[in-house]
């Protein structure tokens, strides 16, 4: 991680934390993430089919950044959502969301990021995902597009 | 800090934390930061020549905001990076990055911010820095441009 | 919270945390917030007339997101501030701020977010608020506009 081996585990219980980075073979929603290589972290939380799976109820800070870019700006509306799904509840719950409209000059090469981050009370078995409106406009560089959380 | 004296140190070990604010005498990259006056925090982490120096291996939430503005928009590409350097490794590692292109109307006065924040596994002696593409377009007000971290 | 009951309180002291969401009956500054329903969290911190009131001195990560949108862009300057007030001190202190100018195409429907987040040393009885420049341009959906903090 970040160019050097992980530190030895601390004596106290393992910190529940994740930092996943963009994976360019995402073909549909929710976004898929790199969970193994590069500056990735995954400890005390599982990754499954695009989602972070909570295994201990508690308070978590959840964050995501998505980097949108294009070559000939058409100002298609962009949205970036972090949402939660739990088998006990019928519907996805949107936790955080960012929207952009009219953000660049028609025809120009353009680039823009959306950042979300906040504290939530999560329950064991909650699945967290990231959704975007225009997959083809997302750039998946590990430093630009990411999704993470940590237990407070 | 924030208009009143620091609280007495807590019994438990000092929290490793930093919040540095914009310093307008930055002349080159990486950006330099105010580490003494105003709403600054620096505890258990060192500040050296623009960088935050980690002295204890572990998990850290790292964040930065940069406020760009100009009198007459010409849509110069803007980038804002948080990167890491360690003497053991030959190359800088970009941890987080934001880019903007085609973000304002040509000729107009404009203003825009870039925010970055995520969790990383850092090792003692890592140096963290912030880089921007257009130094002349950065405004260094303490509430607008900052760089910080805390150990989880 | 988030569609399921809060977890039973942990044995250790209650975590000081807040996540408040947009309240559309805000009529003036500072913004008012939903502190009861939906994905709201409020524990070990009080909410009073738009403000989060600190009752224990220490280090806090404070964040806010505001979602601005309009039907017909006229590029009114937008600002989003998190500020602090304490009866011992005469003046509000701006902790974090975001500004936007020249951000959309004249006459077009537009949407944009501002995100702020950083660590501060807060003292018991500090009151934290959020201010925006153009209240009529704020959308108060709970996933889009929020204000929170947690004690490190």
């Amino acid at each position: 991680q970040i160019g050097h081996p992980s530190p030895p585990p601390e004596k106290k219980e393992l910190r529940k934390v994740a930092h996943l980075t963009g994976k360019s073979n995402s073909r549909s929603m929710p976004l898929e993430w790199e969970d193994t290589y590069g500056i990735v972290l995954l400890s005390g939380v599982k990754y499954k089919k695009g989602g972070l799976v909570i295994n201990e109820t508690g308070l978590y800070f959840v964050y995501s950044k998505v980097y949108f870019r294009g070559q000939s700006c058409n100002n298609l509306p962009l949205s970036h959502k972090v949402y939660m799904r739990n088998s006990k509840y019928p519907q996805d719950l949107v936790m955080m969301e960012g929207k952009m409209m009219s953000y660049c000059t028609t025809g120009q090469m353009w680039a823009r990021s959306s950042y979300l981050g906040a504290v939530f009370n999560l329950t064991s078995a909650d699945h967290l995902y990231v959704n975007v409106s225009e997959l083809s406009l997302v750039n998946f560089e590990e430093s630009q597009t990411f999704f993470g959380l940590y237990k407070l | 800090q924030i208009g009143h004296p620091s609280p007495p140190p807590e019994k438990k070990e000092l929290r490793k934390v930093a919040h540095l604010t914009g310093k307008s005498n930055s002349r080159s990259m990486p950006l330099e930061w105010e580490d003494t006056y105003g709403i600054v925090l620096l505890s258990g982490v060192k500040y050296k020549k623009g960088g935050l120096v980690i002295n204890e291996t572990g998990l850290y939430f790292v964040y930065s905001k940069v406020y760009f503005r100009g009198q007459s928009c010409n849509n110069l590409p803007l980038s804002h990076k948080v990167y890491m350097r360690n003497s053991k490794y030959p190359q800088d590692l970009v941890m987080m990055e934001g880019k903007m292109m085609s973000y304002c109307t040509t000729g107009q006065m404009w203003a825009r911010s870039s925010y970055l924040g995520a969790v990383f596994n850092l090792t003692s002696a890592d140096h963290l820095y912030v880089n921007v593409s257009e130094l002349s377009l950065v405004n260094f007000e303490e509430s607008q441009t900052f760089f910080g971290l805390y150990k989880l | 919270q988030i569609g399921h009951p809060s977890p039973p309180p942990e044995k250790k002291e209650l975590r000081k945390v807040a996540h408040l969401t947009g309240k559309s009956n805000s009529r003036s500054m500072p913004l008012e917030w939903e502190d009861t329903y939906g994905i709201v969290l409020l524990s070990g911190v009080k909410y009073k007339k738009g403000g989060l009131v600190i009752n224990e001195t220490g280090l806090y990560f404070v964040y806010s997101k505001v979602y601005f949108r309009g039907q017909s862009c006229n590029n009114l300057p937008l600002s989003h501030k998190v500020y602090m007030r304490n009866s011992k001190y005469p003046q509000d202190l701006v902790m974090m701020e975001g500004k936007m100018m020249s951000y959309c195409t004249t006459g077009q429907m537009w949407a944009r977010s501002s995100y702020l987040g950083a660590v501060f040393n807060l003292t018991s009885a500090d009151h934290l608020y959020v201010n925006v420049s153009e209240l009529s341009l704020v959308n108060f959906e709970e996933s889009q506009t929020f204000f929170g903090l947690y004690k490190l």
Epitope: C73, N74, N75, L137 | - | -
Partner: antibody, heavy 119, light 111 residues
């Protein structure tokens, strides 16, 4: 399949205006910008401008600003380019082309519309 | 604006031989690791057809004998073994910024 079908040839007098249409089919019209390019006989290709099919606003080559007007009709998936104050040097074949925002180039072109300006 | 200069104006090559076409930009068309240079083929009475995008990427459906190279200001289109259907006019175009500009073309004719 993707098609951009342009309106037929036009003959105009100097000082008049011409409006060329470009009807798109086989894809989601509002997902791509439409660019207009012209080619005078034996001359280079010349970029006129681009319109957002989603938002309806346009960016023009400075050379054509004030004379060219681009519009779209989302309901019929049609883009239009009107050129006013025509002169003999505007005699050219006018092309529309779509440009995917996520790509690098104009990937599909209309068949072209010959506009002849002659007194 | 960026001026595109193509050379030669006309190139005479025999079928089966290799053709190399050049395009120079008045300033760099690179940004962030990509070269915003495209190549089109045009035959009489037809619209241009995209061959190569981003300097070296082959558009789908285009034969592998076409290839592009270069970066910054100097770019090349190569046709490894000319077929009869390849004799046409070839245009380079940048998409780095507005206004987009085209070269004035290289006419590839049968020797």
């Amino acid at each position: 399949q993707v098609q951009l079908v342009q309106s037929g040839a036009e003959v105009k007098k100097p000082g008049a205006s011409v409006k060329v249409s470009c009807k798109a089919s086989g894809y989601t019209f509002t997902d791509y910008t439409i660019h207009w390019v012209r080619q005078a006989p034996g001359q280079c290709l010349e970029w006129i401008g681009v319109i957002s099919t989603y938002q309806g606003d346009a960016s023009y080559n400075q050379k054509f600003k004030g004379r060219a007007t681009m519009t779209v009709d989302k309901s019929t998936s049609t883009a239009y380019m009107e050129l006013s104050s025509l002169r003999s040097e505007d005699t050219a074949v006018y092309y529309c082309a779509r440009f995917p925002d996520w790509d690098y180039a104009m990937d599909y072109w209309g068949q072209g519309t010959l506009v002849t300006v002659s007194s | 604006e960026i001026v595109m200069t193509q050379s030669p104006a006309t190139l005479s090559v025999s079928p089966g031989e290799r053709a190399t076409l050049s395009c120079k930009a008045s300033q760099s068309v690179d940004y962030d690791g990509d070269s915003y240079m495209n190549w089109y083929q045009q035959k009489p009475g037809q619209p241009p057809r995209l061959l190569i995008y981003a300097a070296s990427n082959l558009e789908s459906g285009i034969p592998a004998r076409f290839s592009g190279s270069g970066s910054g200001t100097e770019f090349t289109l190569t046709i490894s073994s000319l077929q009869s259907e390849d004799f046409a006019v070839y245009y380079c175009q940048h998409s780095r910024e507005l206004p987009y500009t085209f070269g004035c073309g290289t006419k590839l004719e049968i020797k």
